[in-house]
Interface confidence: low
């Protein structure tokens, strides 16, 4: 429970705070969990403890592991764990998901991107900022204290932003980089109660025993960006994945955005080798979003042979 993930890049500074809270006056002891070896407090060491902080100056891949911190007060001890992973520097521009900090959003009127974890470091302005590995240039970008301000935000400004700064420890400088996604609020569009285009309510679908059958659940949710737009199939009120019949599977169809701007989704139910018992099941096409859930029910019936006319 009192565990925190921290990560960094080799040859950069990494400072980790003990996940357990305590007053500044409390003593904090740090240990490397795998060996139970105490982390030194002397600053001449590359890895050393400084109260609530554990400092890697600089970090090495071999430093990865779980570190234990014990906050000691006159009346109690509290234990926390810092799960530290140090990664090799990427040769290409892509920042993998595991190096990303939390996503922040902005709009035309408010577009601050804070540099993650910077408050743990001893740094001086200005920060350097990069978007998708390119240094940011132009009057629209303003590095201000620990955050970046983007003027006149556009949807094209969405992307991965990296801040780079120097941590100073006893006169020695160490580089630190941190990356987070920036998303742009879309102020266009609307959502409405889901409209199921197919199948029709209480539709009877004719199938042939022994053959394959496909049912498509298709619904539209509004214009532009949509909240939790989802379509799915249920069998007798149970999710396909929980129903446990390997012959019956659903797969996502095309996510459609029509020329009229409507955002629609398809989910295809595939039934292999249709059996008699499949005719007894109730097939529900569900479409849901913020406004609620709409359900259309389908039943299967045996296809009459063409020559059956007497």
């Amino acid at each position: 429970k009192f565990s925190k993930q921290s990560w960094g890049l080799e040859n950069e500074a990494l400072i980790v705070r003990c996940p357990r809270q305590g007053k500044p006056s409390y003593t904090v002891d740090w240990y490397y969990s795998q060996t139970n070896k105490s982390i030194p407090t002397q600053e001449r060491n590359r890895v050393f403890a400084s109260g609530q902080l554990l400092k890697f100056l600089p970090a090495a891949v071999a430093d990865s592991g779980i570190y234990t911190c014990i906050v000691r007060s006159p009346t109690f001890n509290r234990t926390g764990y810092a799960n530290v992973t140090i990664y090799k520097k990427q040769s290409d521009c892509n920042v993998p998901d595991y190096l990303m900090y939390s996503t922040v959003s902005g709009s035309e009127k408010n577009s601050k991107i804070y540099c993650p974890t910077i408050d743990l470091y001893n740094w001086t302005a200005p920060l350097e900022w990069f978007k998708n590995c390119q240094a940011l240039q132009g009057s629209r970008y303003r590095a201000h204290k620990s955050f970046l301000v983007i003027d006149n935000v556009m949807t094209e400004d969405a992307g991965d932003y990296t801040c780079k700064f120097i941590h100073n420890e006893n006169g020695a400088n160490y580089s630190v980089t941190a990356t987070r996604s920036f998303t742009v609020k879309d102020e266009q569009g609307f959502s409405l109660f889901p409209v199921i285009g197919a199948p029709a309510q209480n539709e009877i679908k004719e199938v042939e025993i022994g053959k394959n059958a496909n049912l498509t659940c298709s619904a539209c949710f509004g214009k532009g960006t949509q909240f939790l737009a989802a379509v799915l199939w249920q069998l007798n009120g149970t999710k396909i994945t929980d129903f446990g019949e390997p012959r019956i599977q659903q797969e996502e169809g095309q996510n459609q955005s029509f020329s009229n701007g409507l955002a629609c989704l398809d989910m295809v139910l595939r039934i292999a080798d249709v059996k008699e018992e499949d005719l007894l099941l109730q097939y529900d096409c569900l479409a849901l979003n913020l406004h609620g859930l709409r359900r259309h029910t389908v039943r299967l019936s045996r296809k009459n042979p063409i020559d059956h006319h007497s």
């Epitope: 969405a158 879309d186 569009g189 609307f190 960006t225 909240f227 939790l228 849901l288 913020l290």
Partner: antibody
């Protein structure tokens, strides 16, 4: 920045109805969902339902179904929440809240495309007291 | 309906402390979780959306994590203005539901 201005406090007798208004000032909320959330004295938050002001489509929590009606007047950028058959336990502060839509990385979610809903602008609340 | 359970219900802490509040959903809600702060007599204020995304204008000492059923809100260094009640809210399915709240008080 849109602000939500709510109507004033109301005192009602059991069995009566109350209609609370929520007006968008400094903009419109025609592109957003508006939720109604209530909070009884000393209690937590309870979502009652929501309306899409541009379409008038509504969705209500089961608990309030049949007693609550949410409407809108697009000409004045106002939404309304009417609660009928009031009882003493309906005494609460009623908030309207604007829902925002933001594009987020699809990888963050396992269900549906990467769109997200939250309530980012709230009215100051309207106190409704039901007492005989 | 999805039930949201917060713990602890109340919490005493001091300025400068690091505080963690947890929220558990009765079923998986992916990352569809928001956190709000509410002060007495005021409307709630959005802090975190999508489990870990910081709302514009919210100080960076607030952070959120988790997915599925277990989520946490962390305040890295408590400030005097942070003493309030905090609510989690699931946005995974209709109807929207809130946790019962965690009251953060001065020790």
């Amino acid at each position: 920045q849109v602000q939500l201005v709510q109507s004033g406090a109301e005192v009602k007798k059991p069995g009566a109805s109350v209609k609370v208004s929520c007006k968008a000032s400094g903009g419109t909320f025609s592109n957003y969902g508006v939720s109604w959330v209530r909070q009884a004295p000393g209690q937590g938050l309870e979502w009652m339902g929501g309306i899409n002001p541009s379409r008038g489509t509504t969705t209500y929590a089961q608990k309030f179904q049949g007693r609550v009606t949410m409407t809108r007047d697009t000409s004045t950028s106002t939404v309304y929440m009417e609660l009928s058959s009031l009882r003493s336990e309906d005494t609460a502060v009623y908030y309207c809240a604007k829902g925002d839509i933001v594009v987020v990385p699809a990888a963050m979610f396992s269900l549906g495309p990467g769109y997200y809903y939250y309530m980012d602008v709230w009215g100051k609340g309207t106190t409704v007291t039901v007492s005989s | 309906d999805i039930q949201m359970t917060q713990s602890p219900s109340s919490l005493s802490a001091s300025v400068g402390d690091r505080v963690t509040i947890t929220c558990r959903a009765s079923q998986s809600i992916s990352s569809y979780l928001n956190w709000y702060q509410q002060k007495p007599g005021k409307a709630p204020k959005l802090l975190i959306y999508a489990a870990s995304s910081l709302q514009s204008g919210v100080p960076s000492r607030f952070s959120g994590s988790g997915s599925g059923t277990d989520f946490t809100l962390t305040i890295s260094s408590l400030q005097p203005e942070d003493f309030a009640t905090y609510y989690c809210q699931q946005a995974n399915s209709f109807p929207i539901t809130f946790g019962q709240g965690t009251k953060l008080e001065i020790k």
